[in-house]
């Protein structure tokens, strides 16, 4: 049972978003008193795996040599010390890309946009999907979800941006996901470069919901405005 021990830290290397077939290592770091580490995967029998600590005993390694759908999901880890089991770590969400073919990302009316104007990024899938994600490269909070409600699936999602400022410029990709699991994503779309022309003195956009109060311009999450054009899709922030 969970004792007063501090919770361990759980992370993945090289990251928590892994392409199908690639290797990933999950690390659980506890204390020097740890005698055993346990990794639990949501909706799987516990424990999912157990490992002895690596010297100097404050962490353990859980290796996945080749990423597949079975490994995608939500993990927590614990460690056991002489006084009992620790509290669970914060969850780690291990996401696999390559589960589905890549969607198509385009900009309407054009990827060249004047500051102060509007642009809509359109992520389209030739087969029906229920979640679309837009990612901006080098953003600290890159994920913006559009998820369909009531299991209704869509062929596309629109991500409107207005007014556009220099902060919106950059490279975007989108992913799509099926209802099987939100931890399984498509291959990434081909990149789309959004080029914002106009004043270099653009004001910072004032987001309707700031994900990180200490974020710099490149860390600002994408802030689309207006209603979601497909009524079956609902906006979800990560």
């Amino acid at each position: 049972q969970a004792g007063p021990l501090p919770k361990p830290t759980l992370w993945a290397e090289p990251g928590s978003v892994i392409s199908w077939g690639n290797s990933v290592t999950i690390w659980c770091q506890g204390t020097l008193e740890a005698r055993e580490y346990r990794l639990d995967k949501e909706e799987s029998p516990a424990p999912w795996d157990r490992q002895n600590p690596l010297e100097p005993k404050n962490k353990a390694r859980f290796s996945i040599p080749s990423m597949t759908e079975d490994y995608a999901g939500r993990y927590r880890c614990y460690y056991r010390s002489p006084v009992g089991w620790s509290q669970p770590s914060d969850p780690l969400e291990l996401v696999m890309t390559g589960a589905y073919s890549k969607p198509t990302l385009s900009a309407l009316p054009s990827p060249l946009v004047t500051s102060g104007k509007s642009v809509t990024l359109l992520c389209q899938s030739r087969s029906p999907m229920d979640t679309f994600l837009l990612i901006k490269e080098r953003a600290a909070h890159p994920l913006l979800h559009l998820r369909s409600e009531h299991g209704a699936q869509q062929h596309q999602a629109e991500f409107p941006m207005s007014p556009v400022t220099s902060v919106h410029g950059g490279t975007y990709r989108c992913f799509s996901s099926h209802g099987f699991s939100h931890y399984l994503l498509s291959h990434p779309s081909d990149p789309l470069e959004l080029i914002v022309s106009g004043s270099l003195e653009d004001p910072r956009p004032s987001p309707t919901r700031s994900v990180s109060t200490a974020a710099g311009p490149e860390d600002q999450p994408l802030m689309p405005t207006g209603s979601v054009p497909h009524s079956g899709l609902r906006r979800h922030w990560e």
């Epitope: 390559g98 589960a99 589905y100 073919s101 890549k102 087969s127």
Partner: antibody, heavy 120, light 110 residues
């Protein structure tokens, strides 16, 4: 050379089964493509049978008329796609093509086709 | 379901003629429409994708236009090699489709 090559066609009796193969070369079936099976009865137009997504999950969709008689599968290790056809009827007599959906959502690569004749 | 209706089903024309084939979708398919040319005993050949983009190696006398539900394939000056059957196809893949192709248009010598 990038190509698709179908095989496995031939004469089969009504009610019988047949498995067609589509071997890909010059590209990987596990990369980001959809592959479709399309057929063409003698003197008729093109008819979509179904498609499989090359992503690891391998989602498949079928034309409404298929009604479970045909199954599309793949073997990534052999870079080959299959069409399993059961309960064949005379009206299934056709040339069967596999074709790749490119980034432009069009069928940019076709096999040469394989003839299936269902007759007693 | 998305139904693709091509017209005419047969078209008689002469070398040098301007030829137009129409494809209508029963609901909007945006610009995800392709056109193919097929000759007897051969696999179809991609001519145009995304409604108006010419595929590699296709002569410039072929052009496509339209979006939403109405699409057109035009051959500006019909050549002897162009007598064939032409098909349109939408790019969506779903489980509620009878077919993704139009019924075809045979272009024959007048």
């Amino acid at each position: 050379e990038v190509q698709l090559v179908e095989s496995g066609g031939g004469l089969v009796q009504p009610g019988g089964s047949l498995r067609l193969s589509c071997a890909a070369s010059g590209f990987s079936l596990s990369s980001s493509y959809w592959i479709s099976w399309v057929r063409q009865a003698p003197g008729k137009g093109l008819e979509w049978i179904g498609s499989i997504d090359s992503g690891s999950v391998g989602i498949t969709y079928y034309a409404t008329w298929v009604k479970g008689r045909f199954t599309i599968s793949r073997d990534n290790s052999k870079n080959t796609l299959y069409l399993q056809m059961n309960s064949l009827r005379a009206e299934d007599t056709a040339v069967y093509y596999c074709a790749r959906h490119g980034d432009n959502w069009a069928l940019d690569l076709w096999g040469q086709g394989t003839l299936v004749t269902v007759s007693s | 379901d998305i139904q693709m209706t091509q017209s005419p089903s047969t078209l008689s024309a002469s070398v040098g003629d301007r030829v137009t084939i129409t494809c209508r979708a029963s609901q909007s398919i945006n610009s995800w429409l392709a056109w193919y040319q097929q000759k007897p005993g051969k696999a179809p050949k991609l001519l145009i994708y995304k409604a108006s983009t010419l595929a590699s190696g296709v002569p410039s006398r072929f052009s496509g236009s339209g979006s939403g539900t109405e699409f057109t394939l035009t051959i500006s000056s019909l050549q002897p090699d162009d007598f064939a059957t032409y098909y349109c196809q939408h790019g969506y893949i779903r489980g509620d489709l009878d077919n993704v192709f139009g019924g075809g248009t045979k272009v024959e010598i007048k």
